[in-house]
Interface confidence: low
């Protein structure tokens, strides 16, 4: 079991990013870029939990690109990278980079949609709807059933988005989606519909089928 010996202060961690995105549909070509804070000689890419070997790139600059062609769902997972310099001695690598979660899927998991403080509100009161997925950095859209275009659209750094509904037009049935913020777009399943009603008005069910 070989453990890297690089102290944190000496060999700072590199940064690992994905292009065009870390969430993609199958068949897309993905480039993982490992960027070192200093010029490096060799970069290595690792995937957690697989016996597959590391990917190596010999370069003499600050970054290395690892090409994953026509990715499959199996190539999704947790990746990290390290770098080394020729004068570090055998087996001495940098600290690991940030962990990059690559998700390869045709459809993102269904978000939840909940009302805060609850789905029954006083007439004229505002209500906040939280659409929550599991992946940060997505674009969220809130729909009212029967209306074709989104009511609201939020780019969120969190794995959720809070939509504020103002006053008298609140009652109705709502659902939400989320998707990757840039192409190639990957869309989530639709949330379960959520009925919002005024106190004392009964639960008007505006729900329509899928």
């Amino acid at each position: 079991d070989f453990t890297p010996t690089a102290p944190l202060a000496s060999y700072p961690q590199p940064w690992l990013g994905a292009h065009p995105a870390a969430v993609v549909t199958p068949g897309i070509n993905v480039t993982l870029t490992c960027r070192a804070p200093q010029s490096a000689w060799r970069f290595a890419l690792f995937k957690s939990g697989l016996v597959t070997p590391l990917l190596l790139r010999d370069v003499s600059v600050e970054l290395a690109e690892f090409f994953l062609e026509e990715v499959t769902p199996a190539q999704g997972g947790s990746y990290h990278c390290r770098y080394r310099k020729t004068d570090w001695g055998p087996g001495v690598w940098s600290q690991p980079s940030n962990v990059l979660e690559l998700l390869v899927t045709d459809q993102l998991p269904r978000p939840s949609l909940v009302a805060l403080p609850g789905p029954v509100v006083a007439p004229g009161a505002n209500v906040s709807l939280r659409c929550a997925g599991r992946i940060p950095g997505m674009s969220f859209a809130l729909y009212r059933v029967g209306v074709a275009t989104p009511l609201q659209y939020i780019d969120s750094v969190q794995p959720w988005a809070d939509f504020l509904l103002i006053g008298t037009h609140t009652p109705g049935t709502y659902c939400c989606y989320y998707h990757t913020p840039s192409a190639p777009y990957v869309l989530s399943q639709r949330s379960q519909p959520l009925v919002i009603s005024f106190e004392g008005s009964g639960s008007l069910d505006y729900t329509q089928g899928n």
Epitope: D1, F46, P53
Partner: antibody
């Protein structure tokens, strides 16, 4: 020139132990995933164990507990410690270097292990 | 018994095209890469194809690999007498490397 040279094979009695070595030359040993593959007489190839650059070694189910893979990066050498040997462990043992994206691109010539009383 | 299934034997005459199949499952071939090896009698295996369809330098373009779903195949065109050997497919799952049982290729005539 890239070369792998296995050694340590030979005749051993059932229940005995043996340590195989694989000396590598021609590239940076510490940068690669190394593995042992065996081939019983007249049979196919069977993966035994692998040693990644970072993290724990991994083993085929049949060998977990009996065999131990290790590496000495300063000596450019891979090892396989084999304990509680059985007649069915008789095989040629190859060491191989793993390439990208999951193949064995360089093989040694193999060393024969015979387990017999 | 191997997790990856190959026919035990195949044959062809010089100049012919021969295909060797390798069948697995979604946990190995279906979601991972396939490699092919040639083993001449009394020698170590030699890498023929990696990453489903790539040839290492020095391997003639008579050898080609492909993958579809949970199966892969090795094609040898313009068969020659020196192609007589054992051929193995190889893939992996989340915890181990896997080999097919091997196919003995005989070049007739």
């Amino acid at each position: 020139e890239v070369q792998l040279l296995e050694s340590g094979g030979g005749l051993v009695q059932p229940g005995g132990s043996l340590r195989l070595s694989c000396a590598a030359s021609g590239f940076t040993f510490s940068d690669y995933y190394w593995t042992w593959v065996r081939q019983a007489p007249g049979k196919g190839l069977e993966w035994v164990s692998g040693s990644p650059v970072f993290g724990a070694a991994n083993y085929a189910q049949n060998f977990q507990g009996r065999f131990t893979i290790s590496r000495d990066n300063s000596k450019n050498t891979l090892y396989l410690q084999m304990n509680s040997l059985r007649a069915e462990d008789t095989a040629v043992y190859y060491c191989a270097k793993a390439g990208i994206p999951g193949h064995f691109d360089i093989w040694g010539q193999g060393t024969l292990v015979t387990v017999s009383s | 018994q191997s997790v990856l299934t190959q026919p035990p034997s195949a044959s062809g005459t010089p100049g012919q095209r021969v295909t060797i199949s390798c069948s697995g499952s979604s946990s190995n071939i279906g979601n991972n890469y396939v490699s092919w090896y040639q083993q001449l009698p009394g020698t170590a295996p030699k890498l023929l194809i990696y990453g489903n369809s790539n040839r290492p330098s020095g391997v003639p373009n008579r050898f080609s690999g492909s993958k579809s779903g949970t199966s892969a195949s090795l094609a040898i065109s313009g068969l020659r007498s020196e192609d007589e050997a054992d051929y193995y497919c190889q893939s992996y799952d989340s915890s181990s490397w896997l080999f097919g049982g091997g196919t003995k290729l005989t070049v007739l005539g």
